[in-house]
């Protein structure tokens, strides 16, 4: 399945939003760092299957969104600029949509992959408890949104990797 | 390979301005806070400030804040040291290292080799 | 700002000594706790992160432990590469403050 052109440009246009979101400096907010433990093995594609890949990716994205979509994310962040992300990450939610029923098909099924799918779930869980016990603060956001941006450049870097071996 | 080379030595008089650099390579270079670090000849480590080079923002130790100026041009991966008005106490060895900001990773994990500053008249 | 204060300033020991040196923080870091090792001439080298975590590429021989103000990096068995300055530093809030340094010598 070919992505689209301007599947990448949607990927760096949301990192440059991510990047906009920031409400207070960061260098006030170290000691509030945490280990949301990222499922990096389901990033590393050596074993990887076109089709899970996908699959994991689309996860991802849609974890985000969900994240960034709660009415504590918006009383907490710049609302245009939420509104543009959803945008970006509703065209790659479908980009990948089509990819999945490309590349799946009837064969295989999305619930082969349901280890994978599950660690992504388990890790955006870490994200929402440590906003919950930190009450949704402003470093709170500042440390998930520095996360997301990391796990999203590591989403984006598996998509480079997949369009390469094509 | 993760890189960060550091301009050469430099020898100059009282009074006199300076800006050196530290160029990163071989890695998201807006991913990473520069931190730069003082060691005087014969002392311990000291730090000075930190820049995240993807907007530029800085801090500063109390004890440099006015003294010096860090800043950052991401284009060319690239954070700099300057100082307008040399002292003589200004001589010691300058390093910069990457930080990784809010992500849980090691902190300055890389480091330039250094740039000797000395200053006298 | 946060004080860190090492001990002791300088030691000497033999190749194959257990060596510890300690860190103490002027209020509590929680894990934030880095260990450097650095040689004559050359820039500082991460040991150990988070207090106990070890850097990619350090040898086991190097561990540390301790959360909150008291923190401990011990060299198992100490080998001749070994011998250097070592500096603790916290990252728990700005300004990053370093210990003032211990020296390892070669008895």
């Known amino acids: 399945c070919d992505l689209p052109q301007t599947h990448s440009l949607g990927n760096r246009r949301a990192l440059i939003l991510l990047a906009q979101m920031r409400r207070i400096s960061p260098f006030s907010c170290l000691k509030d760092r945490h280990d949301f433990e990222f499922p990096q093995e389901e990033f590393d594609d050596k074993q990887f299957q076109k089709a899970q890949a996908i699959s994991v990716l689309h996860e991802m994205i849609q974890q985000t969104f969900n994240l960034f979509s709660t009415k504590d994310s918006s009383a907490a962040l710049d609302e245009t600029l939420l509104d543009e992300f959803y945008i970006e990450l509703d065209q790659q939610l479908n980009d990948l949509e089509s990819c999945v029923m490309q590349e799946v098909g009837v064969i295989e099924s999305p619930l082969m992959y349901e280890d994978s799918i599950l660690a992504v779930r388990k890790y955006f869980q870490r994200i929402t408890l440590y906003l919950t016990e930190k009450k949704y603060s402003s470093c709170a956001w500042e440390v998930v949104r520095a996360e997301i941006m990391r796990s999203f450049s590591l989403s984006i870097n598996l998509q480079k990797r997949l369009k390469s071996k094509e | 390979e993760v890189q960060l080379v550091q301009s050469g030595a430099e020898v100059k008089k009282p009074g006199e301005s300076l800006k050196i650099s530290c160029k990163g390579s071989?890695?998201?270079?807006?991913?990473?806070?520069i931190g730069w670090v003082r060691q005087m000849p014969g002392k311990g480590l000291e730090w000075m400030g930190i820049i995240d080079p993807s907007d530029s923002d800085t801090a500063y130790s109390p004890s440099f804040q006015g003294q010096v100026t860090i800043s950052a041009d991401k284009s060319i991966s690239t954070a700099y040291l300057q100082w307008s008005s040399l002292k003589a106490s200004d001589t010691a060895m300058y390093y910069c290292a990457r930080h990784p900001g809010l992500n849980w990773a090691p902190d300055f994990d890389y480091w330039g080799q250094g740039t000797l500053v000395t200053v006298s008249s | 700002d946060i004080q860190m204060t090492q001990s002791p300033s300088s030691l000497s020991a033999s190749v194959g000594d257990r060596v510890t040196i300690t860190c103490r923080a002027s209020?509590?870091?929680?894990?934030?706790l880095n260990w450097y090792q650095q040689k004559p001439g050359k820039a500082p080298k991460l040991l150990i992160y988070f207090a106990s975590s070890l850097q990619s590429g350090v040898p086991s021989r190097f561990s540390g432990s301790g959360s909150g103000t008291d923190f401990t990096l011990t060299i198992s068995s100490l080998q001749p590469e070994d011998f250097a300055t070592y500096y603790c530093q916290q990252s728990y809030s700005l300004p990053i403050t370093f210990g003032q340094g211990t020296k390892v010598e070669i008895k």
């Open positions: 209020q509590s870091i929680g894990g934030f």
């Open positions: 071989g890695y998201s270079f807006t991913s990473y806070w």
